[in-house]
């Protein structure tokens, strides 16, 4: 029978209304203080019984189903009894350092003893010895500046590298292109400890000691390495170690500064390129190889003794079916599996999403459903690859292909108390935008102002004056899987830091044995009014996905996206404009597709504003085709040696997974394109890749048509 | 004691190349740690670093003449040279050769000059 | 690129007149700036590394001081043979490496 609009409307307000009041910031610290007791490393006993922990609470907070989902994955442990670590060996081949074994435990955590030490997830075991060369932070531009600019070969040498700016997994792929026999990595000062505030306990900065742990791979969005493509369950054929996705050749090894410290002071070689090679010991930052003057004759050491293991994890899995539209999926997910404690990544974030299962679970015990199914996700193993959220979508994939209306995901809810920061869709824009507006700012100074304009504020969008700042997706967390291989509109929201003032990258503390409840509390947000937002920002996203009756996603948005990507990439070619005329690359059919695609959405949303949205088959059909829109800019061949990696208008950067490219396949063709031996080759690859763009934004355009 | 004399023409044409060479005595470049460049000095722009070498090759050009600039080292004849092409009226300058004050402190204070020679840039 | 200013541009002192040059770095350098004494003619000669360590051979009545952006260079009681352009030089960021504009001193 026809609905009330207006009666529909206010029940929507008034629902979400009562939504977002019952979210709690003391039920949040609550569940952040249960989350950080022991460790719950992936594969672990404390894990699983975490799992089933949430598996019977969700189950209480009044979802209809919860299960938990296992799989057996490859991962990645450090020897109990035979530890690693690197050493300066004199020329008799004794050792005259050592690098510290394990992190000093904070206060209060001396007696917990499955304490994983520092390592890095996957490196193979190997006893490499040799000269060190410092490489920066392991870019690809810092490899350059090394072999093209200053002639100094990588080949046969230790490599070591400060942590950030890049994924660590890059920077040991770029330690193995170069010829590297081992890696070590380490936290520079400049990098993880602002100035003017004191180290944990006192602060929130990394002491000397302290150490990031975290996964080498190269995965490209294969999920576990053995069973590419497929679910690691009981039937899965697995390949041989020699054959798995994505691990590194070389051993890895984490330390941290004062470790770095010995190391670096007697390096020997020229001097750094540049300042910004620099960091913050006390060390002159020679670029080597090996050490100088009297302390040539020393070498440096790995040993590495790690294993991999085939291992169950376990995803717990909720399900709220919809009232309406029980077969259209809005999907909210985060890990449970932290590196130590996981004061931040994950429990941060699990915490919140156990806040707004506790919230819609509520609703629903007053029956009041959502109108489409609200799926919650616990994920396992996200800190070995992303292996818990990826078998599990390998798993349903064709479910999530067909039904997969939005996903967003829920990690770490804090890296700073500063700002908003939201990297989503363009289909989300509009409404992260409009909730924004919706919400109390939690900010001083905002005190009866939105977040929006607290957001807007201290992150202006550098493209568009009065509006915040919204960023590419790239990957480096769950919802890879559900936006990269599966085109599922996908968004993700998190207070930050001020990036202006704070260079630090990622918090100081992040993936330390010192990333614990008190450091949220004493430091981070001591009256958890961040998570408090950050939870109404996410559980808003969700619910207006799940209940608003025309889906809340914005082709239009998607359109000037894709104007202002094309726009961009066509810059970068113009850098050779000889070649282009020579080999007769255009990019005229591009922005023809784009302008295409932009009249089309026009008129889209205006037969949107026409909809009679009481009649339910109109409302599905175009409900649909926003939905597919995502889905529209998959290519089921994928990307150029990343067949995981398919969305054509975003990709993880092929230089840092943690970042997002647009229009992936034409940036990596252009590349570096100057270098290339066979020019002709190489522009024929960029003219493959603008065809390929084209197609898909045009295809895309084509689904966005009146369908009859 | 370590001397540094530099040596190349005195007129340069625009257009053309300049070349200058840096002889070296008193010290071994490739066991030394030291590093060696390239300064100059304008009426206008008073003193300009152009330049430093290592003597493993590695190099460190201002990012104002990079484009132009190349430096080359000689260690069998304990030489270092500039080169810089596509000269102007602008590049008409003293130029001294230096030693970074070292060894092993890197890009630090130039401890050591050499007594310049001065280059004119005209048809 | 660290720009480097120097005050005032001419100083005229007296024999035995306290002579204070100043030099100021756009963006924080450390401590790692250099002062030169050049006279007509001549290449500049290394006085102050390290903004206060004196190079080898330089006479007690030099002195540097200052860190990050403000730096000072003093002649306790300067000589007439004291008579030079004086030039500051960063070395903390580069490239560039870059000099200030100089500081004339004059002692009558």
């Known amino acids: 029978k026809p609905s009330n609009e207006a009666t529909g409307n206010v029940s929507h307000s008034g629902m979400k209304k009562e939504f977002l009041h019952e979210l709690k910031a003391e039920n949040i610290k609550k569940f952040l203080y249960n989350f950080t007791r022991t460790p719950h490393l992936a594969g672990t006993q404390n894990n699983f019984e975490l799992a089933k922990q949430i598996h019977d609470q969700w189950k209480e907070f009044g979802l209809d189903l919860v299960e938990l989902s296992h799989y057996d994955v490859l991962l990645s442990y450090p020897n109990k009894t035979h530890p690693n670590y690197i050493s300066i060996i004199n020329e008799d081949g004794n050792e005259i350092f050592k690098t510290s074994l394990s992190e000093q435990p904070p206060p209060g955590y001396e007696n917990i003893s499955d304490v994983v030490p520092p390592y890095s997830a996957f490196s193979p075991q190997g006893t490499p010895e040799g000269d060190l060369v410092y490489v920066n932070y392991a870019r690809t531009e810092d490899f350059f500046k090394l072999e093209r600019e200053m002639k100094i070969s990588c080949s046969g040498k230790i490599v070591i590298a400060r942590y950030g700016k890049v994924f660590r997994g890059n920077m040991v792929k770029n330690a193995q292109l170069a010829g590297a026999k081992g890696m070590i990595l380490y936290s520079d000062p400049a990098d993880y400890f602002v100035p003017a505030v004191k180290s944990y306990p006192d602060g929130w900065n990394l002491p000397g000691g302290g150490v990031q742990r975290g996964n080498v791979l190269n995965l490209n969005g294969a999920g576990d390495p053995l069973t590419p493509g497929y679910p690691a369950n009981e039937h899965a054929y697995r390949h041989e170690l020699t054959n798995a996705v994505g691990l590194p050749s070389i051993p890895v090894h984490p330390i941290g500064y004062d470790d770095a410290q010995k190391l670096l002071e007697h390096m020997g070689g020229p001097a750094p390129p540049d300042s910004s090679w620099k960091g913050g010991l006390k060390v002159p930052y020679n670029v080597g190889p090996g050490f100088a003057g009297n302390f040539s004759t020393q070498k440096v050491k790995m040993h590495i003794h790690s294993y991999t293991k085939v291992t169950r994890i376990y995803n717990v899995i909720g399900t709220l079916k919809g009232a309406l539209e029980p077969d259209r999926y809005v999907i909210l997910g985060g890990h449970r599996d932290a590196w130590v404690f996981g004061g931040i990544d994950p429990q941060s974030g699990a915490a919140v999403v156990h806040e707004i299962v506790r919230s819609f679970g509520t609703l629903k015990k007053k029956g009041r459903r959502p109108r489409r199914t609200i799926l919650f996700a616990s994920w396992d193993a996200e800190e070995f690859g992303l292996l818990g959220s990826t078998e599990w979508a390998e798993e349903h994939s064709r479910l999530l292909q067909e039904r997969g209306v939005a996903y967003i995901n829920a990690d770490s809810s804090i890296e700073g108390n500063y700002t908003l920061r939201v990297d989503c869709t363009p289909l989300m824009y509009s409404l992260v935008y409009n909730l924004t507006k919706e919400l109390q700012s939690p900010d001083e100074g905002f005190e009866g102002k939105s977040l929006y304009d607290s957001w807007k504020e201290k992150s202006p969008s550098p493209e568009f004056i009065g509006m915040p700042r919204i960023s590419k997706l790239g990957s480096g967390n769950d919802f890879e899987v559900f936006f990269q291989r599966l085109g599922i509109a996908s968004g993700r929201a998190r207070y930050t830091k001020n990036w202006k003032t704070n260079k630090v990258s990622s918090y100081p503390l992040y993936h330390s044995v010192y990333e614990t409840y008190e450091l949220v509390v004493k430091f981070y947000d001591p009256t958890f009014k961040y998570h408090l937002t950050v939870a109404q920002v996410r559980g808003a996203m969700v619910f207006e996905l799940a209940n608003s009756i025309v889906l809340p996603f914005d082709c239009q948005s998607y359109a000037v996206a894709l104007k202002k990507y094309a726009d961009t990439i066509y810059n970068i070619s113009m850098k050779h404009p000889q070649e282009m005329k020579a080999y007769m690359i255009s990019f005229d059919s591009l922005f023809s597709a784009v302008n295409n695609f932009t009249d089309v959405a026009s008129k889209f949303n205006q037969r949107l504003q026409e909809l009679d949205k009481s009649n339910p088959i109109l409302l599905r059909i175009m409900n649909d085709q926003l939905m597919y829109l995502e889905r529209a800019f998959i290519d089921p061949l994928g990307l150029p040696g990343r067949p995981f990696y398919r969305h054509i208008i975003y990709a993880p950067s092929s230089h840092n997974k943690y970042a997002g490219e647009s229009f992936p396949g034409i940036y990596d063709a252009l590349f570096d394109i100057s270098s290339k031996v066979n020019a002709s080759k190489a522009w024929n690859e960029v003219k493959r890749q603008i065809s390929i763009a084209t197609f898909t934004v045009q295809a895309a355009a084509e689904t966005l048509r009146e369908v009859a | 004691q370590v001397q540094l004399q530099e040596s190349g023409p005195g007129l340069v044409k625009p257009s053309e190349t300049l070349s200058l060479t840096c002889t070296v005595s008193g010290a071994s470049f490739s066991s030394s740690g030291y590093y060696w460049g390239w300064i100059r000095q304008t009426p206008g722009k008073g003193l300009e670093w152009i330049g430093t070498m290592f003597y493993s090759g590695a190099t460190y050009y201002n990012p104002s003449l990079k484009s132009r600039l190349s430096l080359y080292m000689d260690t069998s004849k304990q030489e270092f040279s500039l080169r810089l092409a596509s000269v102007t009226a602008a590049d008409t300058a003293v130029y001294y050769c230096?030693?970074?004050?070292?060894?092993?402190?890197?890009?630090?204070?130039?401890?050591?000059w050499g007594q310049g020679t001065l280059v004119t840039v005209s048809s | 690129d660290v720009e480097m200013t120097q005050s005032p541009a001419t100083l005229s002192l007296s024999p035995g007149d306290r002579a204070t040059l100043s030099c100021r770095a756009s963006q924080s350098v450390s401590s790692d700036l250099a002062w030169y004494q050049q006279k007509p003619g001549q290449a500049p000669r290394l006085l102050i590394y390290?903004?206060?360590t004196r190079a080898p051979g330089i006479p007690a009545r030099f002195s540097g001081s200052g860190t990050g952006t403000e730096f000072t260079l003093t002649i306790s009681s300067p000589k007439s043979e004291d008579s030079a352009v004086y030039y500051c030089?960063?070395?903390?960021?580069?490239?560039?490496?870059?000099f200030g504009g100089g500081t004339k001193l004059e002692i009558k």
């Open positions: 030089q960063q070395y903390n960021y580069w490239p560039p490496l870059t």
């Open positions: 230096v030693r970074h004050r070292g060894p092993d402190t890197g890009l630090d204070a130039f401890d050591l």
């Open positions: 390290g903004a206060s």
